[in-house]
Amino acid sequence: AQEVQQSPHCTTVPVGASVNITCSTSGGLRGIYLRQLGPQPQDIIYYEDGVVPTTDRRFRGRIDFSGSQDNLTITMHRLQLSDTGTYTCQAITEVNVYGSGTLVLVTEEQSQGWHRCSDAPPRASALPAPPTGSALPDPQTASALPDPPAASALP
């Protein structure tokens, strides 16, 4: 079965710094999403080879991509405290497949010592339950489509 390898599990960075999240699969995708989880999940990007990436307005100008949709590294720049959260990759194949999540902790520089990542991956219990038809070792949110809310339409 298709899987999404996502790394890192957790990262602590100061305000203004950058973070890399990598989503790797065995191929055969239609595209991949990075979504910030929460009561109101928010799509951050949609990436599909050969198509202009879709980026949510909040991250416009702060996102870079390297690699391909099968092995994608997403770099989020100039992080703000409000960017703290769990981000998950969603690979679109014939089913939905999810990464294990990356907990990004953005801290004020002087308080970094108080907020550190443990070695454990983000707890699945903190994430919403998956749709019944999804293939998943990892529970997350369901399928998505490109073109951001309140963001300019991209081809």
């Epitope: 239609r30 999940p41 928010q42 014939e94 089913v95 749709p131 399928s143 998505a144 489509l145």
Partner: antibody, heavy 117, light 107 residues
């Protein structure tokens, strides 16, 4: 049992507006993308718009700039705001659950929108 | 946009007959094809997704096959309750597009 119930259809004059609603029950609404599909009288199916669980939206060229799809996860509701309506928008509008980005596995009963002077 | 061409547009067959409906895409769609059934005056229902996977509750007389640009829906033994219009739909690329439909009637 998953259920989708549309409302808000009716008769409107060309250039007018309508807001369709779709109330969902029996599913974790916030976990699913949702779509609107329409069917003109005696015609086939036409995809109109979709919104992901995370809020990304997409529209058919025929409605882009006139229709807006949105959702309220707290109310388990999907919406379609339709502005600048034309006679060719006359159709039954269905909301559908989008299981895997285009795999529309549950449909509502539909609501009829008639655009006529 | 990907165009979906369905044939025939209508057919009439006897109960127990094997019925085949074809759908052709204007470009390869990598098996991202669904089939829907719409009975007269009713809501469309998903029959088959991803070319050949039977949706839950759908009778096994329905099957799907195909690859690349050409896809087929087969009803192995037509039943009176199968009178309906059948639509194919590609979901390889946005915008999602449907075939024009095939109306199936009983002789």
């Amino acid at each position: 049992e998953v259920q989708l119930v549309e409302s808000g259809g009716g008769l409107v004059k060309p250039g007018g507006s309508l807001r369709l609603s779709c109330a969902a029950s029996g599913l974790t609404f916030s976990s699913y993308a949702m779509s609107w599909v329409r069917q003109a009288p005696g015609k086939g199916l036409e995809w109109v718009a979709s919104i992901s669980s995370g809020g990304f939206t997409y529209y058919a060229d025929s409605v882009k700039g006139r229709f807006t799809i949105s959702r309220d996860n707290a109310k388990n509701s999907l919406y379609l705001q339709m502005n600048s309506l034309r006679a060719e928008d006359t159709a039954v509008y269905y909301c559908a659950r989008d299981e895997v980005r285009g795999y529309l596995d549950v449909w509502g009963q539909g609501t009829l929108v008639t655009v006529s002077s | 946009d990907i165009q979906m061409t369905q044939s025939p547009s209508s057919l009439s067959a006897s109960v127990g007959d094997r019925v085949t409906i074809t759908c052709s895409a204007s470009q390869g769609i990598s098996n991202y094809l669904n089939w829907y059934q719409q009975k007269p005056g009713k809501v469309p229902k998903l029959l088959i997704y991803y070319t050949s996977s039977l949706h839950s509750g759908v009778p096994s007389r329905f099957s799907g096959s195909g690859s690349g640009t050409d896809y087929t829906l087969t009803i192995s033994s037509l039943q009176p309750e199968d009178v309906a219009t059948y639509y194919c739909q590609q979901y390889s690329k946005l915008p999602y597009t449907f075939g024009g439909g095939t109306k199936v009637e009983i002789k």
